[in-house]
């Protein structure tokens, strides 16, 4: 806290510039007007203030905004947004897009810092959604932001802002986000061709049903190994050795190195062994010829 | 780049319980979520529990009611309490957080 003194004579300050640098503390707090300051706070930026400076300007507009500042300031934070507290950006009410990029600009290299949570959950929340561009931005910043988000927030993601995310956005959602993030996006891309479709769903598979997968296997997309691998077992292991040929077209040979994986490990002991075969893989562990195969899910669910 | 560490890794018998941790370094937040994800000899990465921005957790079934993850904002540190560890348990454990990786911990269980 900065005692109140009054300004030396002649130390007024009529505008905000470089000779600022040269005040003391207790001089900035007593020759810059706050109200100034919020109008010129773009050119904050411009001069090297030292930390213990900056903290005396944040104190002047906390005094002159006690309810929180007002975008036009916040947009011209700068490096002061880093001395900002959760409590202070709480306190905000961010709707600007452009105000969030100028901000994340700012902590760009840094880690996500609770600052930075903070200002992501107050303009989601202001916006209600989360919309394409915001997506963009946010997954710009931060590749990792969509699959933090529970399976309950993705659900209110639209279908129209999954056009926003890249592969690497997806690369650590597990089984549970895939699943709601998979329907949205294939409403999102359903009106595309079947080439240009396959390369948008496929970071996506992770979600998909067996039906889908059984469709896809009509196109003749051929699905590299690493796709199927993160494909939900249960998926999986209702198709057919001939629907998995046609789904891998080139790479079925990758079978054979991660026959001892799920779900190809999974899949193979569903197979009868002389469709396996047929495949000429040396895939061991299905079903021996002469074997009755009961499918008890089924039975359960009849009686 | 964000940085994580795991620890809490080790050996023991079978039925017993781990407690591992996942602390980010710096500034950085885990009011973000982290994840737990895990690679047996020989086998894929599998995924094992989530605790997602909201606090909200998910689970894989195979772990379900025996692991509890949980994280403390204070500490930027996310736990997998491991009980009742199966043999199929044993695996290198790894946290993730924003598309960040630790470089892992190691579980044994032993009969």
């Known amino acids: 806290e900065v005692e109140k003194t009054a300004c030396p004579s002649g130390k007024k300050a009529p505008e905000i510039d470089e000779s600022l640098i040269f005040y003391k503390k207790w001089e900035l707090e007593a020759c810059v007007d706050a109200a100034l300051l919020a109008t010129q706070m773009d050119r904050v930026n411009a001069i090297p203030f030292t930390y213990e400076q900056l903290d005396v300007l944040k104190h002047k507009l906390d005094e002159l905004y006690p309810q929180g500042y007002p975008e036009s300031v916040i947009q011209h934070l700068g490096y002061l947004f880093l001395k900002m507290s959760p409590e202070d950006i709480r306190k905000w009410n961010v709707t600007s897009l452009e105000t969030l990029k100028a901000l994340l600009e700012v902590n760009k290299g840094h880690e996500m810092s609770p600052q930075v949570a903070t200002l992501i959950d107050r303009f989601v929340k202001g916006r209600g959604q989360l919309d394409k561009d915001t997506l963009d931005t946010l997954t710009a910043f931060y590749p990792g932001y969509l699959c933090s988000l529970s399976p309950e927030e993705l659900s209110s993601v639209p279908p129209s802002s999954i056009w926003a995310v890249r592969p690497q956005d997806l690369d650590t959602c597990d089984p549970r986000q895939l699943d709601v993030l998979y329907p949205k996006a294939r409403l999102a891309f359903q009106n595309m061709n079947g080439s240009e479709y396959f390369v948008k769903i496929q970071s996506f598979l992770g979600g998909a049903p067996t039906e889908d997968l059984k469709a896809l296997s009509q196109q003749n997309v051929s699905m590299d190994l690493a796709t199927f691998m993160k494909l939900r077992t249960d998926a999986v292991l209702p198709l057919t050795v001939a629907e998995v040929q046609k789904l891998l077209g080139p790479h079925v040979e990758g079978l054979k190195a991660e026959e001892r994986h799920r779900p190809v490990r999974d899949w193979i002991l569903r197979q009868r062994q002389d469709d396996l075969d047929t495949l000429g893989l040396g895939l061991q562990g299905g079903i021996p010829n002469g074997y009755l195969v009961l499918d008890l899910s089924m039975q359960e669910a009849l009686s | 780049q964000l940085q994580l560490v795991e620890s809490g890794g080790g050996l023991v018998q079978a039925g017993g319980s781990l407690r591992l941790s996942c602390t980010a370094s710096?500034?950085?937040?885990?009011?973000?979520?982290a994840k737990w994800f895990r690679r047996a000899p020989g086998k894929e990465r599998e995924w094992v529990a989530s605790?997602?921005?909201?606090?909200?957790?998910g689970y894989d079934d195979s772990v379900k009611g025996r692991f509890t993850i949980s994280r403390d904002l204070a500490k930027n540190t996310v736990y997998l309490q491991m009980n009742s560890l199966r043999l199929e348990d044993t695996a290198v454990y790894y946290c993730?957080?924003?598309?960040?990786w630790g470089q892992g911990t190691q579980v044994t269980v032993s009969s």
């Open positions: 605790v997602y921005r909201d606090g909200t957790t």
């Open positions: 710096g500034s950085t937040s885990m009011s973000y979520g």
């Open positions: 993730t957080a924003l598309n960040s």
